[in-house]
C-alpha cells in the first residue's frame, strides 16, 4: 500500500481535524517544555505543508517520511539545546536514528508545574471564548506531562473534556455538574496512562514476542469463542498499532486503530458476542469501548488441555513444526479457560511448559519428562491466590489510607534507596488495588489485581530508570517482565541500607496543611512516614503506628487552633523530640 | 446520536443525471463533516465525496470529478450528491456517513477522507446505471 506522499495520504484519511491534533500531540509528547504557542505555530506549519502535498504529491519534499518530516520540523526550534541540552545531539543524526534519539529522550517525570484547576467561571470563559484553542491547550498539557500517553485515546478524553464543558458551562450550578467530571477525567487520564506506559515498556524493553504473547493471553480471555486464527490477527494487528504510538507514529497508529475497530464491528460474530453495543458507539468511543469490553462467555464442553498438550505422543513434533505458533496455542486454549487468572499468570505457565518442552523433547522420553507439567502449575497458581487473600483480608481491615501506609513501610524497607516522592507514588497506586480489586468476587479477584500491581510496578521500573539508585529495583525491572510482581513481593528488609540522616527540617510543618484536600494532607503525612522509615529502617509497625497517631494529632491540633503557626513551630518541635525518644534516634 | 437517511437512487440510463439527499435527525447538524462512499458488488466500500461542517471546503475521488457535485444545506439538515454523466461503473450502493471528530475545530477543516474515520451511518441507496 505505496504511497507516492505519506503525508498526503495520512491527512486525506485521517482529516485536518484529527491530523492537527495527533501532530500536536506527537510533538508535545517529543518536546515536553516547549510552549504552546511554539508548538502550535509549528503544527500549522506542518499542516500547511500537508496540504501542499494533497493538492499535489509530486511537490517537493511530500515524498519524505513523517519522521523526516516531523523531526527537521522539531529540529528548528531555536532553544532546542538551552532547553534541552543534550537532546539537541539527537538533531545531528539522520533517519531512523534520530526519531530513536527522541524517544529516548522523552521523560516520564517532566519537570513541569502542577496543573492548576482554575475557576469554574473563567474555565467556562475560555471555553466560550475559543473552543479550538482550550482544547488543544487540554492536549498539549495531557501529551507533555505523559509523553506515552495514547494518542487516539487522548482524542477520546479531549472530546469527554469538550463534553463536560458544553454541558455544564450553561448548567445552573456549572461547578457542581463540571468539577466530579473532570475529577472523573483525571484519574481515567492517569490510569490510562500507566496502562498504554506498560504496553510501550513491555515492547521496548522485553521486544514484539513479549507484547504479543500479554496480547494473545488477554484477548483469548476476552474473546473466547473466537478462533486461534482470528486472535492471531487481532494479535498481529493490536501489536502494529502499539508499536506505532509507542514509537511516535502517532498518524500511523490512530489509523490502523480506526481500521481495527472496524474490522472488529464488521467481523463480530466470528470474535465476541458482547461488542454489539460498542459496535453502535462512534469511532473514538467505540475503540475504548472494544479496549474495555468485559470477556465474553466461555464456549461450553471445552476439552480438557491435557489431551493436546500432555497426552499427545505429537506434542515435541507439534512444537518443533513451530514453536511459537504451538506455545501460543497453548497460551490462548489455557487463557480462553480462565478468565479468573491474571495475564502475568498465565504467560509464567506458558513460560513453563516451554521450559520443561525445550528440557524434555531432547530427552530420552520425551512424553515421561514432560508427563507431570501441569503439576507444576500449581504453586504458581497458589503464590498470587495466597497474596491477594491475604493483602485483601488487610485491606478489609485497615481500610485504604492506612493499608497504603502499610504498604509504604514495606516497600521502604525494601528499596530504601529510592526518592520519597516514587515510594509515596508508588505505595498509594498500590494501596488502591484495595478498593479496586477487594470487592470483586475470588474469580475476578486476580485478573483485577495482579494485572494492575504490574501497571503500578511498571511505573516504579520507569521512574527508577531515570535515575537509578538501586541495583534491586533494578534487578526486578528488567529479568523478567512477568515475574515483576513476584519479585518485588519476594525482597525482604534491605540489610546493606545504612539509614539516613537525622534531618528536623523534614519533620517540620506549617499552618499551610491546614488548607490542604484530604488527600494532601496524606501525601504529607505519608511522605513523613517513608522519610521516619528512612531514617529507621528497624523501627516496628507498633512504633510507626505511634509516631504516625500522634502525627495525626498534632495536626488536628493545631489545625484547630488560633495561633496555627505558633503551634506547628512550638508543637512541632515536642513532637520531633518525642519521635526520636519513641523510635531511639 | 445521528441518524442518516438516504434517497434518491434508481435506475438511469448512462449518461444521465440522479440527485442523491441524506437527511440526518439528531444532534446538530453542523457538527459534522459528511460524506458520500459507494460499494459495489463484492468490491470494498470506497469513498466517492465528502464535506466541511460549513460546506465551504469539498473533496472527490477522482473517478467522478468534474461529474458529481456534493452540497449541504444545514439548515434543513441534509446533504445532496448531484450526480451528472452517469457511466456504468457508477452503480453502486451509496452510502451516507457522518464525521463528528473533535467537533472543535474550524468549520471548514478539510473532513477524513477513510470510511474508518466516520462515526455514523445510512442504510445506503441503490443506484444502477444501465448502459
Known amino acids: 500500500d505505496a504511497h507516492k506522499s505519506e503525508v498526503a495520504h495520512r491527512f486525506k484519511d485521517l482529516g485536518e481535524e484529527n491530523f492537527k491534533a495527533l501532530v500536536l500531540i506527537a510533538f508535545a509528547q517529543y518536546l515536553q517544555q516547549c510552549p504552546f504557542e511554539d508548538h502550535v505555530k509549528l503544527v500549522n506549519e506542518v499542516t500547511e505543508f500537508a496540504k501542499t502535498c494533497v493538492a499535489d504529491e509530486s511537490a517537493e519534499n511530500c515524498d519524505k517520511s513523517l519522521h523526516t518530516l516531523f523531526g527537521d520540523k522539531l529540529c528548528t526550534v531555536a532553544t532546542l539545546r538551552e532547553t534541552y541540552g543534550e537532546m539537541a545531539d539527537c538533531c545531528a543524526k539522520q533517519e531512523p536514528e534520530r526519531n530513536e534519539c527522541f524517544l529516548q529522550h522523552k521523560d516520564d517525570n517532566p519537570n513541569l508545574p502542577r496543573l492548576v484547576r482554575p475557576e469554574v467561571d473563567v474555565m467556562c470563559t475560555a471555553f466560550h471564548d475559543n473552543e479550538e484553542t482550550f482544547l488543544k491547550k487540554y492536549l498539549y498539557e495531557i501529551a507533555r506531562r505523559h509523553p506515552y500517553f495514547y494518542a487516539p485515546e487522548l482524542l477520546f478524553f479531549a472530546k469527554r473534556y469538550k463534553a463536560a464543558f458544553t454541558e455544564c458551562c450553561q448548567a445552573a450550578d456549572k461547578a457542581a455538574c463540571l468539577l466530579p467530571k473532570l475529577d472523573e477525567l483525571r484519574d481515567e487520564g492517569k490510569a490510562s496512562s500507566a496502562k498504554q506506559r506498560l504496553k510501550c515498556a513491555s515492547l521496548q524493553k522485553f521486544g514484539e514476542r513479549a507484547f504479543k504473547a500479554w496480547a494473545v493471553a488477554r484477548l483469548s480471555q476476552r474473546f473466547p469463542k473466537a478462533e486461534f486464527a482470528e486472535v492471531s490477527k487481532l494479535v498481529t494487528d493490536l501489536t502494529k498499532v502499539h508499536t506505532e504510538c509507542c514509537h511516535g507514529d502517532l498518524l500511523e497508529c490512530a489509523d490502523d486503530r480506526a481500521d481495527l475497530a472496524k474490522y472488529i464491528c464488521e467481523n463480530q460474530d466470528s470474535i465476541s458476542s458482547k461488542l454489539k453495543e460498542c459496535c453502535e458507539k462512534p469511532l473514538l468511543e467505540k475503540s475504548h469501548c472494544i479496549a474495555e469490553v468485559e470477556n465474553d462467555e466461555m464456549p461450553a464442553d471445552l476439552p480438557s488441555l491435557a489431551a493436546d498438550f500432555v497426552e499427545s505422543k505429537d506434542v515435541c513434533k507439534n512444537y518443533a513444526e513451530a514453536k511459537d505458533v504451538f506455545l501460543g496455542m497453548f497460551l490462548y486454549e489455557y487463557a480462553r479457560r480462565h478468565p479468573d487468572y491474571s495475564v502475568v499468570l498465565l504467560l509464567r505457565l506458558a513460560k513453563t511448559y516451554e521450559t520443561t518442552l525445550e528440557k524434555c523433547c531432547a530427552a530420552a522420553d520425551p512424553h515421561e519428562c514432560y508427563a507431570k507439567v501441569f503439576d507444576e502449575f500449581k504453586p504458581l497458581v497458589e503464590e498470587p491466590q495466597n497474596l491477594i487473600k491475604q493483602n485483601c483480608e488487610l485491606f478489609e481491615q485497615l481500610g485504604e489510607y492506612k493499608f497504603q501506609n502499610a504498604l509504604l513501610v514495606r516497600y521502604t524497607k525494601k528499596v530504601p534507596q529510592v526518592s520519597t516522592p516514587t515510594l509515596v507514588e508508588v505505595s498509594r497506586n498500590l494501596g488502591k488495588v484495595g478498593s479496586k480489586c477487594c470487592k470483586h468476587p475470588e474469580a475476578k479477584r486476580m485478573p483485577c489485581a495482579e494485572d494492575y500491581l504490574s501497571v503500578v510496578l511498571n511505573q516504579l521500573c520507569v521512574l527508577h530508570e531515570k535515575t537509578p539508585v538501586s541495583d534491586r529495583v533494578t534487578k526486578c525491572c528488567t529479568e523478567s517482565l512477568v515475574n515483576r510482581r513476584p519479585c518485588f513481593s519476594a525482597l525482604e528488609v534491605d540489610e546493606t541500607y545504612v539509614p539516613k540522616e537525622f534531618n528536623a527540617e523534614t519533620f517540620t510543618f506549617h499552618a499551610d496543611i491546614c488548607t490542604l484536600s484530604e488527600k494532601e494532607r496524606q501525601i504529607k503525612k505519608q511522605t513523613a512516614l517513608v522519610e521516619l522509615v528512612k531514617h529507621k529502617p528497624k523501627a516496628t509497625k507498633e512504633q510507626l503506628k505511634a509516631v504516625m497517631d500522634d502525627f495525626a494529632a498534632f495536626v488536628e491540633k493545631c489545625c484547630k487552633a488560633d495561633d496555627k503557626e505558633t503551634c506547628f513551630a512550638e508543637e512541632g518541635k515536642k513532637l520531633v523530640a518525642a519521635s526520636q525518644a519513641a523510635l531511639g534516634l | 446520536d445521528v441518524q442518516l437517511v438516504e434517497s434518491g437512487g434508481g435506475l438511469v440510463q448512462a449518461g444521465g443525471s440522479l440527485r442523491l439527499s441524506c437527511a440526518a435527525s439528531g444532534r446538530t447538524f453542523s457538527s459534522y463533516a459528511m460524506g458520500w462512499f459507494r460499494q459495489a458488488p463484492g468490491k470494498e466500500r470506497e469513498f466517492v465525496s465528502a464535506?466541511?461542517?460549513?460546506?465551504?471546503?469539498?473533496y472527490y475521488t477522482d473517478s467522478v470529478k468534474g461529474r458529481f457535485t456534493i452540497s449541504r444545506d444545514n439548515a434543513k439538515n441534509t446533504v445532496y450528491l448531484q450526480m451528472n454523466s452517469l457511466k456504468p461503473e457508477d452503480t453502486a450502493v451509496y452510502y451516507c456517513?457522518?464525521?463528528?471528530?473533535?467537533?472543535?475545530?474550524?468549520?471548514?477543516?478539510?473532513?477524513?477522507?477513510?470510511?474508518?474515520?466516520?462515526?455514523?451511518w445510512g442504510q445506503g441507496t441503490q443506484v444502477t446505471v444501465s448502459s
Open positions: 464535506i466541511s461542517r460549513s460546506g465551504g471546503s469539498t
Open positions: 456517513a457522518a464525521a463528528e471528530g473533535l467537533a472543535s475545530g474550524s468549520y471548514d477543516y478539510t473532513p477524513p477522507l477513510k470510511s474508518s474515520w466516520y462515526d455514523y
